[in-house]
Interface confidence: low
């Protein structure tokens, strides 16, 4: 079943995933799409990233987070009701069968008041488990639900909104670490 | 193709703040880590930070006290601010791109920058 | 912060000569995040080699890196006019970013 998240008209919407690189600069080709995961890639593409770098995105979609750590969250800017669906992430992990596919279901809801112009939201999460993941950059905490018998996390948030961005952030950075692999 | 600008005065008194701005053309900043590095006259390059494009920043840990670096992604700009400078700021300043994996594949011109009264 | 040494200093050769630079590093690097840089006089660096051993665009193949860990080569196999230069090793893989000093290749 889908993780349901909401945005309203005029809003960005965060549909957030997560993976930990086995390796600095081991990264793993991830793909976006509207609809859900299908059997192979994604279906109507919208992002998608390479071993090294987002090499392809649409209009209005884009990663805000740090790629190169996991951080494949998909931001949607200007939402309009157009934009409820399923949305597919899908970790592109080496092997036959191998992938890591999530389903995210993004509801929008019309707008209470014509809204000013805002910042994205950020959404934090709540799992049982935290990883700070490893570059060269500040340490972002993740939180992580279960791991698999593979050398990728990957995650999917159940969350609620955090209003403001730099709250997120404080929490990405609070610094809990646990080496995993 | 992708090229980086630096741009800023040339010349900044001890004490006072340096200030520098890269101006990316050919392709968005809205991907990738960009990077401050200098070069003081006939030695080595030191990385001073860089600054990812959702605005999380990293900067070296011997300038980390006077050093921001900010993006203006509607300009396609990002910015070096390095304060309480002294003779031993002069050098060459150069900005780059770094793609994670690639490295810093591309790099401006540079601009000369020195500290004198 | 990972300390990177590079040897010799400088290494006066010939054109048509092969080239070793070395680049040693003070812990573990990934080769994953280990670069080279060619810099000439009064311009800025240029992109060689990535990930330790693979060249970057439009870099010819008498360039190429090698090594793993704490050692790592840079190897021009023929050393044409517009290599003589200064080289720089760099590490990407942890904070903060580091380059060697350089080696001044220069004409013999």
């Known amino acids: 079943s889908e993780v349901e998240y909401r945005a309203e008209v005029g809003q960005n919407a965060y549909l957030p995933c997560f993976y930990t690189p086995a390796a600095p600069g081991n990264l793993v080709p991830v793909c976006w799409g509207k609809g859900a995961c299908p059997v192979f890639e994604c279906g109507n593409v919208v992002l998608r990233t390479d071993e090294r770098d987002v090499n392809y995105w649409t209009s209005r979609y884009w990663l805000n987070g740090d790629f190169r750590k996991g951080d494949v969250s998909l931001t949607i800017e200007n939402v309009t009701l157009a934009d409820s669906g399923i949305y597919c992430c899908r970790i592109q992990i080496p092997g036959i069968m191998n992938d890591e596919k999530f389903n995210l279901k993004l509801v929008i809801k019309p707008a209470k008041v014509t809204p000013a112009p805002t910042r994205q939201r950020d959404f934090t999460a709540a799992f049982p488990r935290m990883l700070t993941t490893r570059g060269h950059g500040p340490a972002e905490t993740q939180t992580l639900g279960s791991l698999p018998d593979i050398n990728l996390t990957q995650i999917s948030t159940l969350a609620n909104e955090l209003r403001d961005s730099r709250l997120a952030n404080d929490l990405r950075d609070s610094g809990a670490t646990i080496r995993i692999g | 193709q992708v090229q980086l600008q630096e741009s800023g005065p040339g010349l900044v008194k001890p004490s006072e703040t340096l200030s520098l701005t890269c101006t990316v053309s050919?392709?968005?900043?809205?991907?990738?880590?960009w990077n401050w590095i200098r070069q003081p006259p006939g030695k080595g390059l030191e990385w001073i930070g860089y600054?990812?494009?959702?605005?999380?920043?990293n900067y070296n840990p011997s300038l980390k006290s006077r050093v921001t670096i900010s993006v203006d992604t509607s300009k396609n700009q990002f910015s070096l601010k390095l304060s309480s400078v002294t003779a031993a700021d002069t050098a060459v300043y150069y900005c780059?791109?770094?793609?994670?994996?690639?490295?810093?594949?591309?790099w401006g011109q540079g601009t000369t920058v020195t500290v004198s009264s | 912060e990972i300390v990177l040494t590079q040897s010799p200093g400088t290494l006066s050769l010939s054109p048509g000569e092969r080239a070793t630079l070395s680049c040693r590093a003070s812990q573990s690097v990934s080769s994953s995040y280990l670069a080279w840089y060619q810099q000439k006089p009064g311009q800025a660096p240029r992109l060689l080699i990535y990930?330790?051993?693979s060249r970057a665009t439009g870099i010819p193949d008498r360039f190429s890196g090698s090594g793993s860990g704490t050692d790592f080569t840079l190897t021009i196999s023929r050393l044409e006019p517009e290599d003589f230069a200064v080289y720089y090793c760099q590490q990407y893989g942890s904070s903060p970013l580091t380059f060697g000093g350089g080696t001044k290749v220069e004409i013999k």
């Open positions: 990930g330790a051993s």
């Open positions: 050919g392709g968005s900043i809205s991907r990738h880590y």
């Open positions: 780059a791109r770094d793609t994670g994996y690639y490295g810093m594949d591309i």
């Open positions: 600054i990812h494009y959702s605005g999380s920043t």
